[in-house]
């Protein structure tokens, strides 16, 4: 009755994410059978997050729009193992958007999911960010000092990378 | 007011190159992206790519790739598209025009007609 | 790539007239939709965007709706100066390609 009942609110749980993934790769987190996390596929998976690369060329409000309507946000970035699981799936001559950008103008970044903006834990390159026009955030590869982010016009078509929570079941 | 005023008519063999300019006034120059787009004499509108005037930084229809390139020359407030190994396909008018805050074209240049002809 | 199918490629039409012209993306395209109006010779104006915003000093009788990838540009009476083409663009991802264009003519 107890295993029913659990599989029961397994199907009703995926159904919710059906519309916009309707493949999951789930893995037994632990030792017990009862708990499953899943990232929808072909996400990636890492500590408690999925990551997508999106390829097609978007202006940064467009990325995060189609980031929202899968059910994720423009990436956060809160540590360097983080960053440095990210950039295993990214192509060296292209550039990606962050979920970070400067709105005002006034040098106030903020994270798409509100997360407080620490200058301690971020990754820019050297002399970056450097132009008031250049409101969102991108991470890019250069050769000097391998991955780094950049500041770049919002409007510049770019890939990007969404991130979710992963689910669990 | 906001301007953009585009170089004269061109008239090239195939096989070479054009470069169009596209001179910006009235705002400021490196806050707007630019963009090209072309028309084929009696046809419909063709996006080229865009050009960020601060940076430089371009994105580009991959129709195009390789063949064009967009540059700016901030001390003059001009944007430039060169097209290589012209076609007689390539005969067409091409506009530059600033997307706006709203991410749209709210200005555009006047049209500069290329033709290639042997 | 995203393509953009516009109907009718002409209509003919009287003044007065109330003239409808259809946009179908092949994907969604979230409302990040533009319509312009364009004159033999002369660069394209911008009419709407974001689907159904007026642009600055566009006459009230232009109106848009529509959502996911199905778009409509609505002239509630036509005007003399009306008579011109008119071409739908979209923006969600590049390349951002055009409808092929209506031609509104005069009956």
């Known amino acids: 009755n107890f295993m029913y009942s659990k599989t029961v609110k397994r199907l009703s749980k995926l159904r919710e994410y059906q519309q916009y993934h309707p493949s999951l790769t789930c893995v037994m987190e632990g030792k017990d059978i009862e708990d499953w996390s899943c990232c929808p596929t072909p996400w990636t998976s890492f500590q408690s997050s999925c990551y997508f690369i999106s390829t097609g060329m978007q202006s940064w409000t467009k990325s995060q729009k189609n980031c929202s309507v899968m059910g994720a946000d423009l990436v956060v970035i809160n540590t360097r193992e983080e960053q440095d699981f990210i950039i295993q799936n990214l192509k060296r001559n292209s550039s990606y958007f962050l979920g970070l950008s400067d709105p005002g103008g006034r040098r106030h970044w903020q994270w798409v999911d509100q997360t407080p903006y620490n200058e301690n834990v971020t990754f820019w390159h050297s002399g970056e960010p450097n132009n008031l026009d250049e409101r969102c955030a991108i991470i890019n590869f250069r050769s000097s000092e391998e991955w780094g982010w950049n500041d770049i016009h919002c409007h510049v078509p770019q890939k990007s990378i969404c991130k979710m929570k992963k689910i669990y079941i | 007011q906001v301007q953009l005023v585009q170089s004269g008519a061109e008239v090239k063999k195939p096989g070479a190159s054009v470069k169009v300019s596209c001179k910006a006034s009235?705002?400021?120059?490196?806050?707007?992206?630019i963009h090209w787009v072309r028309q084929a004499p009696g046809q419909g509108l063709e996006w080229m790519g865009t050009i960020y005037p601060g940076a430089g930084d371009t994105s580009y229809n991959q129709k195009f790739k390789g063949r064009v390139t967009m540059t700016r020359d901030t001390s003059t407030s001009t944007v430039y598209m060169e097209l290589s190994s012209l076609r007689s396909e390539d005969t067409a008018v091409y506009y530059c025009?600033?997307?706006?805050?709203?991410?749209?074209?709210?200005?555009w240049g006047q049209g500069t007609l290329v033709t290639v002809s042997s | 790539d995203i393509q953009m199918t516009q109907s009718p490629s002409s209509l003919s039409a009287s003044v007065g007239d109330r003239v409808t012209i259809t946009c179908r993306a092949s994907g969604n395209i979230h409302n990040y939709l533009a319509w312009y109006q364009q004159k033999p010779g002369k660069a394209p104006k911008l009419l709407l965007y974001?689907?159904?915003t007026l642009a600055d000093g566009v006459p009230s009788r232009f109106s848009g709706s529509g959502s996911g990838t199905d778009y409509t540009l609505t002239i509630s009476s036509l005007q003399p100066e009306d008579f011109a083409t008119y071409y739908c663009q979209h923006f969600w991802s590049t390349p951002y390609t055009f409808g092929g264009g209506t031609k509104v003519e005069i009956k």
């Open positions: 974001d689907a159904e």
């Open positions: 009235g705002y400021t120059f490196t806050s707007y992206i």
């Open positions: 025009a600033r997307m706006g805050d709203n991410e749209y074209f709210d200005y």
